[in-house]
Amino acid sequence: AGVFELQIHSFGPGPGPGAPRSPCSARLPCRLFFRVCLKPGLSEEAAESPCALGAALSARGPVYTEQPGAPAPDLPLPDGLLQVPFRDAWPGTFSFIIETWREELGDQIGGPAWSLLARVAGRRRLAAGGPWARDIQRAGAWELRFSYRARCEPPAVGTACTRLCRPRSAPSRCGPGLRPCAPLEDECEAPLVCRAGCSPEHGFCEQPGECRCLEGWTGPLCTVPVSTSSCLSPRGPSSATTGCLVPGPGPCDGNPCANGGSCSETPRSFECTCPRGFYGLRCEVSGVTCADGPCFNGGLCVGGADPDSAYICHCPPGFQGSNCEKRVDRCSLQPCRNGGLCLDLGHALRCRCRAGFAGPRCEHDLDDCAGRACANGGTCVEGGGAHRCSCALGFGGRDCRERADPCAARPCAHGGRCYAHFSGLVCACAPGYMGARCEFPVHPDGASALPAAPPGLRPGDPQRYL
C-alpha cells in the first residue's frame, strides 16, 4: 500500500507564438482545479480503461480575473498535493492523465459551470520510495509543469511497496537474516509471512500465508506468466502443466467494493460500479457533493450542496458511470454492419464501409454498379439475377455488350413466365401475383411464407415490363 503524490508547479501559456487567451475574464472570473487519473501501465488497453490505480481531484485554486490587455500569465494554482492512495503493490510502470479544469464563477443559473481546459497524458516508469520526478507536458498552447512520486505507507517498503517493516525488537541490530529497512534504519525488514514458495519478484502479501500476484502473473505462487493461450477455464490462462488455470477465487469473490458497490471482473482485475455519492477504485470515497466537482469529463452535476443530498452526473456523449469517469468504448458494441471499420472519434462515431455498402452504420447494401457504364441502352439496377446491368431487349452480359435472351436472367418473380417481346420482356404472373415482374403477391397467406398460388384466383393478365 502507498500513495502517489502529484505536485502541480505551473499551468500557463507554453513557449512560442500563439499564446492562448486567458480562460478567465472580468465578466467571467474563474478558478482552476486539477484531476489526475492513474492506470497500471503494463496493460495495452490502458488508454481506455478506467482509473484502475485510482483518481484524485485537487482543491479549487484562487479566483482569477484577467487584467484587460495583459497576456495570459501562469494561472493561480490550488494549494497542496494531489494524492492517490493505492492499496496493492505499486506497479512500477503506470499511465497518467492530468486534466486542468476551469470553474466559471459568473452568475450562471444553477451554480458554477465546469469546462475542461487541457488534458495531458503519458506513460512512465517509477519506483516507489524514489525522489520526486519532474515533468513538463504540453496540451495545445498550454504548458503544465509538475512533479510526482510514489511512496509506501508503513509498514510497506521497497520499490513496489511489497516488503513489510516492523520496529526493531532489539535496540542494536536486526534478527538473523533480516536487513534494516532503509530509509527507516530504526526498523527491520519483517520476517517473511507470505505463503511458502510465493514468488519474491511477482508475488506479495499483506496477510500471513497469502500470495497475491502483481499484474501479469498468476498461479497460487505467482510463478506463471499470464499468457494469451486459449483455455477452457473461465478464469483464463495459466497452470504450468496444462497452460490453463483451474478456476479459483476470482477478483470479485468477497466483493471488494464498499458502500454497496457492485463488482464486475475485468480481464486483469475487477471494476466497481459505485452508487451515487461514492467513488474511488473500491467505492471507498464518500461525502461528495456538486461542490466537490465529482463529475469528470465535462459531466454536468445536479444535486444539493449539503453532504446528505445525492448528486447526479449527466454525462456527455462518450462517457458513462456514476461520475462520468468511464469512457464508453462505443466500437465494442460493433455498431458498423457488414464488416465496416469502426472509428471512435470521441465527439462522434464513424463507420468506414466496405465496398458495396453505405450509410452511417454501413447498413445499406448497395449494388456494385456505381460508376459502371451499361452498353446498348442498358441501365444499372439491382435485380435480374447476377447481371449488374438491366439490359435492353436483345442484349445481355455484364455490361450489355452481348446479344442475349432477355429472359435468361429470370426477371419474373414468384414463378412468373417470361416472354421476349418486341417492345420489351413480358412476365405472365403465376396466379395470385401481380406487378411488372410479379413481385407483389395479391393475397399473401401469412407474413413469412407465401403460397405459390392461393386457390380460387384466376391467373393475372401478362404484365409488360418496359
Epitope: 447498413e363 447494401d365 449494388d367 418473380a413 411488372a436 415482374r437 413481385e439
Partner: nanobody
Framework: EVQLVESGGGLVQPGGSLTLSCAAS????????MAWYRQAPGKKRELVAG???????YYMDSVKGRFTISRDNAKNSVYLQMNSLRAEDTAVYYC???????????WGQGTLVTVSS
C-alpha cells in the same frame, strides 16, 4: 437481411388523412420492390399499393385516386399517403419488400389504422 419498421398509424375520422412510413434498414430501398398491404379483422391480407425497384406504381382499385405510394431513397423509406379515408380502410397496414438479389420477401410488424367517427 432487410428490416422494416412501420409508423404513422392511428385513429382518424372519415374523410381525414394519414401518412404511413416504412423505414428499411440493412439494405437500400432503391433496389427493392416495396408495397403496402392491409388486413382487416377476419379478412385476408390484401395488396393496397406497390412500387417496383424501377419506380412503377400499382394500386388496388378501391384506393386509386385516394392513396399514393412513394419512396425516398435518401431517407431509405417508403410512404403511403392516404386521403379521403373511409371506415372500410380500417385495418392493420403492413410494409412489404421484395429483394431481387436473393429473391426473398420481408415484412414489417404492422401499424393499426382506425377510421371512425
Amino acid at each position: 437481411e432487410v428490416q422494416l419498421v412501420e409508423s404513422g398509424g392511428g385513429l382518424v375520422q372519415p374523410g381525414g388523412s394519414l401518412t404511413l412510413s416504412c423505414a428499411a434498414s440493412m439494405y437500400s430501398v432503391s433496389f427493392l420492390s416495396m408495397a403496402w398491404y392491409r388486413q382487416a379483422p377476419g379478412k385476408k391480407r390484401e395488396l393496397v399499393a406497390g412500387i417496383s425497384n424501377e419506380g412503377s406504381t400499382y394500386y388496388m382499385d378501391s384506393v386509386k385516386g385516394r392513396f399514393t405510394i412513394s419512396r425516398d431513397n435518401a431517407k431509405n423509406s417508403v410512404y403511403l399517403q392516404m386521403n379521403s379515408l373511409r371506415a372500410e380502410d380500417t385495418a392493420v397496414y403492413y410494409c412489404y419488400a421484395y429483394k431481387w438479389r436473393s429473391r426473398s420477401t420481408y415484412w414489417g410488424q404492422g401499424t393499426l389504422v382506425t377510421v371512425s367517427s
